[in-house]
C-alpha cells in the first residue's frame, strides 16, 4: 500500500532544495501542477504553478522557485534556489483537478533551513539567473486562487531500517528521514 | 545484507515479452527509487526508466514508451520490469538499480542487481 | 537529450600510473555527474557522484573534479584490480544518459 510519507531535508542558508515528485503519467501529464507550502494551523498556500496545460520539461520560474514538469516520465521536479530561514516548513506538490479538490503527490517535504556558509564549495548560489541560466518565464494561466480545505496530517513515523545512501555533505543526526542534500553552482 | 537479486536468464522469440524481476533486501524497499539500465553484448550502458516502489508510479525514455511496463509487489520487495514486442537488439543484459531516495533529484545508482541476460532469437 | 562523451575510448596503463578519464556534456549540467566502474561480467559500479564525491568503501586514489560541461575522473596511482571500463553518466534532467565508456587495459 501507498504510505504518505514526509522526508525531511536540511540545508543552508544560500542551498538549493533539489526535489521530485511523481504521478500517474496517464492521468496527469498536461495537468497543471503547483508547489504549495502548509504552514501550521492554515491551508496551504500556493507558491508557484506549471502552465496550463503544463507544457513538457518547459521550466518556470516564479521567484526562487523554479518548476519543471517533465510530461514524458510522470515526474515534476521543484527547485528553491538561494535559500533562507523563512522558507522553513511543510511543503507538497498538488495537482489540479478543477472543480474537484487539488490531488497531493508524494512526498511532502519538510525543510529545514539554517543560518551560516555550509563550508561546501559552489552552495553560495546567491544568483538564481547565474546559477540556472534559465530565462525567467511567467506562466500564462496564473495559479488558481482556490486552496485546498484539506487537514494537515503528520505522517506516520516510518520505517528505520534505512542504509545510508552516498549523500554526505550536510551533517546527519541520528534521525533516520532527514536527507542531506549536495549543493551547486 | 543490501542487496538487489534478480531472475535468471531468458531466451525468448520476436514479438514475446519477457517479465524481469528484482528483489530487495536489507533496506526500506518504498524509500528508493528503481532504476533499469541495459547494457548489449560489448555496448554502453542504457537508462529505461525509473520507478517510484512506494506509488507505484513508473517513467521510461521515449525508445521503450508503450513497450515498457514497471510494476512492484511492495509486500515481498519485488520490482518487475517487462519489455514486450521483443526484437533482436533487445538481446542485452538488463540491470535493475537502486537510486535515490523517492522525493530527492539525485539520480545516483548506488546499488546493482547482478544482471538478468535476455537473448531474443528465432 | 544531453550527449555524453567520453575521452579516451580506450587507454593502455601501468600499475602506478596516474591516469585521467574526461567526460564532456553537450550542455552545461552543473555538477550533476556520477562516475561507475565496471569490470567484465559483473554489475557497475558507483564510485564518484556529484561529480567529486567519493562513494563510501572506494579507495581514496580515485577522485573526481570538474562542473559545468568538463569532468576528470583521475586514478592517482593504478591498482591491478582498477583495469576496467569506466563511465560517465548525467542527471541534470531527463532522460539520463551514460558516457560510451573508457576502457582501461593493461599496457
Known amino acids: 500500500a501507498t504510505k504518505l510519507t514526509e522526508e525531511k531535508y536540511e540545508l543552508k542558508e544560500g542551498q538549493t532544495l533539489d526535489v521530485k515528485c511523481d504521478y500517474t503519467l496517464e492521468k496527469f501529464a498536461s495537468s497543471q501542477k503547483a508547489w504549495q507550502i502548509i504552514r501550521d494551523g492554515e491551508m496551504p498556500k500556493t507558491l508557484a504553478c506549471t502552465e496550463r496545460p503544463s507544457k513538457n520539461s518547459h521550466p518556470v520560474q516564479v521567484g526562487r522557485i523554479i518548476l519543471e514538469d517533465y510530461h514524458d516520465h510522470g515526474l515534476l521536479r521543484v527547485r528553491m534556489v538561494n535559500l533562507q530561514v523563512e522558507d522553513s516548513g511543510l511543503y507538497q506538490c498538488v495537482i489540479y483537478q478543477p472543480p474537484k479538490e487539488p490531488h497531493m503527490l508524494f512526498d511532502r517535504i519538510r525543510l529545514v533551513v539554517t543560518k551560516g556558509f555550509s563550508g561546501t564549495p559552489g552552495s553560495n548560489e546567491n544568483s538564481t539567473q547565474n546559477v540556472y541560466k534559465i530565462p525567467p518565464t511567467t506562466t500564462k494561466a496564473l495559479c488558481p486562487l482556490y486552496t485546498s480545505p484539506r487537514t494537515v496530517t503528520q505522517a506516520p513515523p516510518k520505517s528505520t531500517a534505512d542504509v545510508s545512501t552516498p549523500d554526505s555533505e550536510i551533517n546527519l543526526t541520528n534521525v533516520t528521514d532527514i536527507i542531506r542534500v549536495p549543493v551547486f553552482n | 545484507q543490501v542487496q538487489l537479486v534478480q531472475s535468471g536468464a531468458e531466451v525468448k522469440k520476436p514479438g514475446a515479452s519477457v517479465k524481469v524481476s528484482c528483489k530487495a533486501s536489507?533496506?526500506?524497499?518504498?524509500?528508493?527509487?528503481i532504476n533499469w539500465v541495459r547494457q548489449a553484448t560489448g555496448q554502453g550502458l542504457e537508462w529505461m526508466g525509473w520507478?517510484?516502489?512506494?506509488?507505484?508510479?513508473?517513467g521510461s525514455v521515449q525508445k521503450f514508451r508503450g513497450r515498457v511496463t514497471m510494476t512492484r509487489d511492495t509486500s515481498i520487495h519485488i520490482a518487475y520490469m517487462e519489455l514486450s514486442s521483443l526484437r533482436s537488439e533487445d538481446t542485452a543484459v538488463y540491470y535493475c538499480?537502486?537510486?535515490?531516495?523517492?522525493?530527492?533529484?539525485?539520480?545516483?545508482?548506488?546499488?546493482w542487481g547482478r544482471g538478468t541476460l535476455v537473448t531474443v532469437s528465432s | 537529450d544531453i550527449q555524453m562523451t567520453q575521452s579516451p575510448s580506450s587507454l593502455s596503463a601501468s600499475v602506478g600510473d596516474r591516469v585521467t578519464i574526461t567526460c564532456q556534456a553537450s550542455?552545461?549540467?552543473?555538477?550533476?555527474l556520477n562516475w561507475y566502474q565496471q569490470k567484465p561480467g559483473k554489475a557497475p559500479k558507483l564510485l564518484i557522484y556529484?561529480?567529486?564525491n567519493l562513494e563510501t568503501g572506494v579507495p581514496s586514489r580515485f577522485s573526481g573534479s570538474g562542473s559545468g560541461t568538463d569532468f576528470t575522473l583521475t586514478i592517482s596511482s593504478l591498482q591491478p584490480e582498477d583495469f576496467a571500463t569506466y563511465y560517465c553518466?548525467?542527471?541534470?534532467?531527463?532522460?539520463?544518459?551514460f558516457g560510451q565508456g573508457t576502457r582501461l587495459e593493461i599496457k
Open positions: 550542455q552545461d549540467i552543473r555538477k550533476h
Open positions: 553518466q548525467h542527471y541534470a534532467n531527463l532522460p539520463i544518459t
Open positions: 520507478m517510484n516502489p512506494n506509488s507505484g508510479n513508473s
Open positions: 556529484d561529480a567529486a
Open positions: 536489507g533496506y526500506t524497499f518504498t524509500r528508493y527509487d
Open positions: 538499480a537502486r537510486g535515490g531516495y523517492t522525493s530527492s533529484w539525485r539520480w545516483y545508482f548506488d546499488l
